[in-house]
Interface confidence: low
């Protein structure tokens, strides 16, 4: 697999992926207890015909081109979690494993 | 998770897996032995904020707004793989199991 | 040898209960849709419902609230709880395989058991 | 829920004639349609899958065609172990909640 990276000083219009430092503290979200702040990346970009297709079903599907089938957009293709401690509804500390917090690579599906 | 399915006649305008069967004798795709045909659905429809939401991560995107990033849009969340038996470059038979041919679920990311 | 075989049939009083079972041997229960279909003497064939991939069970509007599909994939069975039987579900009650086109389960069905008989009657 | 509705009820042919069957769903059900073929005391065949693809092990004078909500089993050289009856079969959209069975088409041999 394989995806772009791009920065903001980056040209390139294709589907890539994007820094993006996500802050809990600047949205107010004051139940996170740690980390206050973390590397979360984005995906943006266009996709045009087979570039960066994740799956081959979204080849298929451009093939037989059903009614109302949007081309392909970029989206995340591979994510991984991160540990955080925070406050649930009851006010008890927890501490565990996010799921897709982080986007690794981004695609076109 | 969850994820609405739908048919051609549905007015259902959000996010929404449709059924789709791929021929690929249609496509003129030879060296594919088998299956002929298989279901391999698509996903279409539109993402409104929080709807099918797939990842905390798309909500902290849209909370976070960076330059460039697009809403979430209508792609597959689940899928799953078909055997198949194809030719491949060399002209040799080959069975194999091909990843994320089928769309099982779809959802905002 | 791949094979279903139904059991657990035979003659039951209205308001009854039964659990029929199938036992499936030659491949593995889990990856594949499992139905249950009926025939009633003389009659075509009815569906019942469906365990599918991931355990979760459909059902025929007739057959919700009183028909429970269930398996057990340690003893690779699948079964069928009938209650509050009636004369009417008197049938040749069939368990199916979902059809493997070549690694997806259908929902339709290429492997079927004999049939076991209900007779609901007092 | 999606209805099958065949016909004709019962056919009556001669040894090497053409059959064709008709089934008709109540909306479309674009390609999600089989044919079973069943003799007394024993339990269904699958024939047909997807509309138009011939199940393992069948001969190939079964035919299945149609899309939508029109289809056709035909039989293009009727043989006397064809005689049985034919049930079609959908299984309700991509949402597989619902599996619906036509009534059946009875095939004599003259």
């Known amino acids: 697999d394989f995806g772009l990276d791009c920065d903001e000083h980056s040209t390139e219009s294709r589907c890539c992926r994007y820094p993006l430092t996500v802050d809990f503290e600047a949205f107010g979200w004051d139940w996170i207890i740690a980390p206050k702040r973390y590397k979360a990346n984005y995906c943006s970009g266009e996709c045009e015909f087979v570039f960066l297709q994740k799956y081959p079903h979204t080849h298929l599907v451009h093939q037989a081109n059903p009614r109302g089938s949007a081309g392909p957009c970029c989206t995340p293709t591979k994510m991984s979690p991160i540990n955080m401690l925070y406050f649930n509804g009851k006010e008890q500390i927890i501490y565990g494993k996010i799921p897709a917090m982080v986007v690794d690579r981004c695609g076109c599906s | 998770d969850f994820g609405l399915d739908c048919d051609e006649h549905s007015t259902e305008s959000r996010c929404c897996r449709y059924p789709l069967t791929v021929d690929f004798e249609a496509f003129g795709w030879d060296w594919i032995i088998a299956p002929k045909r298989y279901k391999a659905n698509y996903c279409s429809g539109e993402c409104e904020f929080v709807f099918l939401q797939k990842y905390p991560h798309t909500h902290l995107v849209h909370q976070a707004n960076p330059r460039g990033s697009a809403g979430p849009c209508c792609t597959p969340t689940k899928m799953s793989p078909i055997n198949m038996l194809y030719f491949n470059g060399k002209e040799q038979i080959i069975y194999g199991k091909i990843p994320a041919m089928v769309v099982d679920r779809c959802g905002c990311s | 040898e791949v094979q279903l075989v139904e059991s657990g049939g035979g003659l039951v009083q209205p308001g009854g209960s039964l659990r029929l079972s199938c036992a499936v041997s030659g491949f593995t229960l889990s990856h594949y849709v499992k139905g249950w279909v009926r025939q009633a003497p003389g009659k075509g064939l009815e569906w019942i419902g469906i365990i599918n991939i991931e355990g979760e069970t459909y059902y025929a509007s007739w057959a919700k609230g009183r028909f429970t599909i269930s398996r057990d994939n340690s003893k690779n069975t699948v079964y069928l709880q009938m209650n509050s039987l009636r004369a009417e579900d008197t049938a040749v009650y069939f368990c199916?395989?979902?059809?493997?086109?070549?690694?997806?389960?259908?929902?339709?069905?290429?492997?079927w058991g004999q049939g076991t008989l209900v007779t609901v009657s007092s | 829920a999606v209805v099958m509705t065949q016909s004709p009820a019962t056919l009556s042919l001669s040894p090497g004639e053409r059959v064709t069957l008709s089934c008709q769903a109540s909306e479309s059900i674009h390609h999600e349609l089989s044919w079973y073929q069943q003799k007394p005391g024993q339990p269904p065949k699958l024939l047909i899958y997807?509309?138009?693809t011939l199940a393992s092990g069948v001969p190939s004078r079964f035919k299945g065609s149609g899309s939508g909500t029109d289809f056709t089993l035909t039989i293009s050289s009727l043989q006397p172990e064809d005689a049985a009856t034919y049930y079609c079969q959908t299984y309700d959209g991509i949402s597989h909640y619902g599996v619906a069975f036509g009534q059946g088409t009875k095939v004599e041999i003259k």
């Open positions: 997807l509309a138009s």
């Open positions: 199916a395989r979902g059809h493997d086109n070549f690694g997806y389960s259908y929902h339709d069905f290429n492997l």
